[in-house]
Interface confidence: medium
């Protein structure tokens, strides 16, 4: 870069590129100022003129240092399924997350959830893993010997069998065991 | 490296129509315009006019509009030069040229020949 | 347009003399006007931008000067290699131009 230019708008030395926060136009051949988040290019700059910038409208929102000509919509209000854990404001997008009970079935490029289900349940004999599946819904994994799942449920894991000093009925995957009264 | 590979030599009649291709690499296409310039045999150089390669919005010289079209493929990195109603006075050599603030990087060349 | 009137059309000269090439804009280009060397079966190249930065890799004695309508491109100690012909752009306004090349020949 030539040690005369310092300032936006400056042409720069072919095929170099712009310093942080600043973008090259085309049009102009030029090094221009980028708007800061919150902000959009309300006129691009020429050779003479640097970017004028001005603030996002309501619900609209840049994250970034950018050159866009429009900002960005804010994702439409969360649904009844939903929380909103990040409010839309003019330097980011709304986030919205699945209640309790509940699973994001399909996220957005953002993080934000766009559609949330129900989590799966897991029948006797079988007890919510300790990982989920990729998609964030329950898996469900066979109580191993020595445990046991008697509800349908989305969080129950499976439990120890209770130890007897008198086995009565011995426990399976789905059944606890049953001891006998002590004489 | 920065290369600007062009497509070969073309023979074509008059009122024909003729794509010249230029595939770029070693830089990321979409930051750069793309100049178009016509040298006529033993002439001088004629800008032609460029294409933004972001918006893919071209631009032409007075001269250069109507029968002229700039094209883009970004997928491939790859500019795109078309030609119709080929004329006898259209034989030239055809670069394409990075940039329009001093051209850095310049393509080898199309020879177009019209000829009947 | 922009008319670049580029003299003198040919220049004569021996290698290590000191070779001065003219450009004159017909409208005030500020300091847009970029100079090219070109050689016979060869793509241009350019060896100055915005009037008088030279290059990435150009030797230093090229140079060049001038602002609004006059520039000049200076050659200090011509080289056998630097004989090919020379055109000046300005890429200030639409339609960009090129002057008609000046031919660089030796003496």
């Known amino acids: 870069l030539p040690a005369q230019v310092a300032f936006t708008p400056y042409a720069p030395e072919p095929g170099s590129t712009c310093r942080l926060r600043e973008y090259y136009d085309q049009t102009a051949q030029m090094c221009c100022s980028k708007c800061s988040p919150g902000q959009h290019a309300k006129v691009f700059c020429t050779k003479t003129s640097d970017t004028v910038c001005d603030d996002c409208e309501a619900s609209m929102y840049t994250q970034v240092w950018n050159q866009f000509r429009t900002c960005l919509s804010c994702s439409s209000s969360c649904t009844t399924d939903q929380v909103e854990i990040r409010a839309c404001t003019k330097q980011q997008n709304r986030v919205c997350a699945c209640e309790a009970g509940r699973y994001c079935a399909l996220k957005t490029h953002s993080g934000s959830c766009r559609q949330c289900m129900r989590l799966s349940k897991c029948g006797p004999g079988f007890g919510v893993a300790s990982s989920r599946a990729p998609n964030g819904n329950v898996l469900c994994k066979a109580c191993a010997p020595g445990t046991f799942s008697d509800t349908t449920s989305s969080t129950d894991v499976c439990r120890p069998h209770r130890i007897c000093s008198i086995l009565a009925i011995p426990g399976n995957a789905s059944t606890d065991a049953v001891c006998a009264p002590e004489s | 490296q920065i290369q600007l590979v062009q497509s070969g030599a073309e023979v074509k009649k008059p009122g024909a129509s003729v794509k010249v291709s230029c595939k770029a690499s070693?830089?990321?296409?979409?930051?750069?315009?793309m100049s178009w310039v016509r040298q006529a045999p033993g002439q001088g150089l004629e800008w032609m006019g460029w294409i933004h390669t972001y918006s893919g919005v071209p631009t032409y010289a007075d001269d250069f509009k109507g029968r002229f079209a700039f094209t883009l493929d970004t997928s491939t990195s790859t500019a795109y030069m078309e030609l119709r109603s080929l004329r006898s006075d259209d034989t030239a050599v055809y670069y394409c040229?990075?940039?329009?603030?001093?051209?850095?990087?310049w393509g080898q060349g199309t020879l177009v020949t019209v000829s009947s | 347009e922009i008319v670049m009137t580029q003299s003198p059309a040919t220049l004569s000269l021996s290698p290590g003399e000191r070779a001065t090439l003219s450009c004159k804009a017909s409208e005030n280009v500020v300091t847009y006007v970029s100079w090219y060397q070109q050689k016979p079966g060869q793509a241009p190249r350019l060896l100055i931008y915005g009037a008088s930065n030279r290059y990435t890799g150009i030797p230093a004695r090229f140079s060049g000067s001038g602002s609004a309508t006059d520039f000049t491109l200076t050659i200090s100690s011509l080289q056998p290699e630097d004989f090919a012909v020379y055109y000046c752009g300005q890429s200030y306004t639409y339609p960009y131009t090129f002057g008609q090349g000046t031919k660089l020949e030796i003496k």
């Open positions: 070693g830089y990321t296409f979409t930051t750069y315009g």
């Open positions: 040229a990075r940039g329009l603030y001093g051209v850095d990087y």
